[in-house]
Amino acid sequence: KKVVLGKKGDTVELTCTASQKKSIQFHWKNSNQIKILGNQGSFLTKGPSKLNDRADSRRSLWDQGNFPLIIKNLKIEDSDTYICEVEDQKEEVQLLVFGLTANSDTHLLQGQSLTLTLESPPGSSPSVQCRSPRGKNIQGGKTLSVSQLELQDSGTWTCTVLQNQKKVEFKIDIVVLAFQKASSIVYKKEGEQVEFSFPLAFTVEKLTGSGELWWQAERASSSKSWITFDLKNKEVSVKRVTQDPKLQMGKKLPLHLTLPQALPQYAGSGNLTLALEAKTGKLHQEVNLVVMRATQLQKNLTCEVWGPTSPKLMLSLKLENKEAKVSKREKAVWVLNPEAGMWQCLLSDSGQVLLESNIKVLPTWSTPVQP
């Protein structure tokens, strides 16, 4: 008996061939001996089976002695043994229909779990193997679960169902709802305008939800909400914003926030959360602000940074085109009695300059100038 695997919702074509290459009397029936379809000469006739409106054949092939049974929009319950009778011969085909579906939704938040459920006909014992877009393989029986979805899990999952040494392949598109970056850091000199961007890693037709930016300033004892906003069909509208600092927000995606000026009291970490309509859980992106200030007070040239810096960052003070006068893994450095000239304060990571502030030290009879 020939075995054919089908996919729920798809179309399958079961073949039946006569020894004579001409149109002759044929009919298909199921295991309950109920007629599905047959012919009356060159015309088709349909039996009273449940398949009635989904069963078909190809009349154009009858003259070649081929009498296929086509079943459209396959259902799991179409799994059965189908018998083609042509001339005095019988051909039996066992059709097994499988379905693979993702739990509830194919749009899942980062960190959530994905469960794939296999629908299979009674008596079958299939095995399933799925390959994620990042090449990770998972195996299972009736259900497969992947916990803690990551951004790289977005894309087409390819699942292979194996039964009777035959296989059928399913492709399921999974969208992991997340920001493009889990965390970002912005380095600014005191007084500069700060731009925060929160690009999403997915695109959907309609995006509706609400969000908030909570900020923990390094100098503050507790965090506070800087801004709350609504998102309706990709349009952003501000609901509430603090007076200090007075953030501005772009009206379109990607989410964009502007801080008029970087000040030491604003340096710190923020957490932008976005709750999407009809989704449990929230999207998160961390954002950090590091602010630099270079000052000269009397005979002391000081460079300071505020905000979340890693211990391996180097803060240096150097006279232009000269070796660094001072270089430390600290958040403040200074030079006493600096010589006149253009001094540079540099925040660097493994030789790469992240932030730079210049200050001009004048001869001792004049006051310093900050460009």
Epitope: H27, Q33, Q40, V86, D88, K90
Partner: antibody
Amino acid sequence: QVQLVQSGAEVKKPGASVKVSCKASGYTFTAYVISWVRQAPGQGLEWMGEIYPGSGSSYYNEKFKGRVTNTRDTSTSTVYMELSSLRSEDTAVYYCARSGDGSRFVYWGQGTLVTVSS
Amino acid sequence: DIVMTQSPDSLAVSLGERATINCKASQSVDYDGDSYSNWYQQKPGQPPKLLIYVASNLESGVPDRFSGSGSGTDFTLTISSLQAEDVAVYYCQQSLQDPPTFGGGTKVEIK
């Protein structure tokens, strides 16, 4: 030429069975479906079932399922229809008919009158 | 089952006149460009005789005054010029889906 010759009239008592024959000639017996159609006095036509002479597979109208049996004898090119548990409303002319291109009933037998009476 | 409803139940037409019989199916009997509707003529004491198959095809040996038309659910048998030998009962039938079903019949008489 194609000919379907049926057996003669029958009188049966309620609860009995009747077996009507239909002998085919003038064509390849196994190549065409044969149906049974009945007509009660002064009434319309009603399809009872069909047989594929090649394989012997039969299909029946749900209305008659369990009471009607179609069989065939390829050696004599004859098809039989047996109706059991007869009741008075089964009194009718029973026809065998052969399919053709586009229709189930191109050639007809002359009919067999079955009378069910106590 | 597909129900075939014929109208009228009986029809009296003068010799040489046109006779028209209608048949309505409870659902479409169209498939793959063809309409699976057939017409039969039955005279007293005789088996039915196929006149038209697949809505409009004239069975061989049938006079061309008989014609069939229609598609989907509505079908018509027309006798363009009624002859004395056309007095009979006419049945429509669908052959797309089992069980094949017949209309109740239309008796055609001469006026």
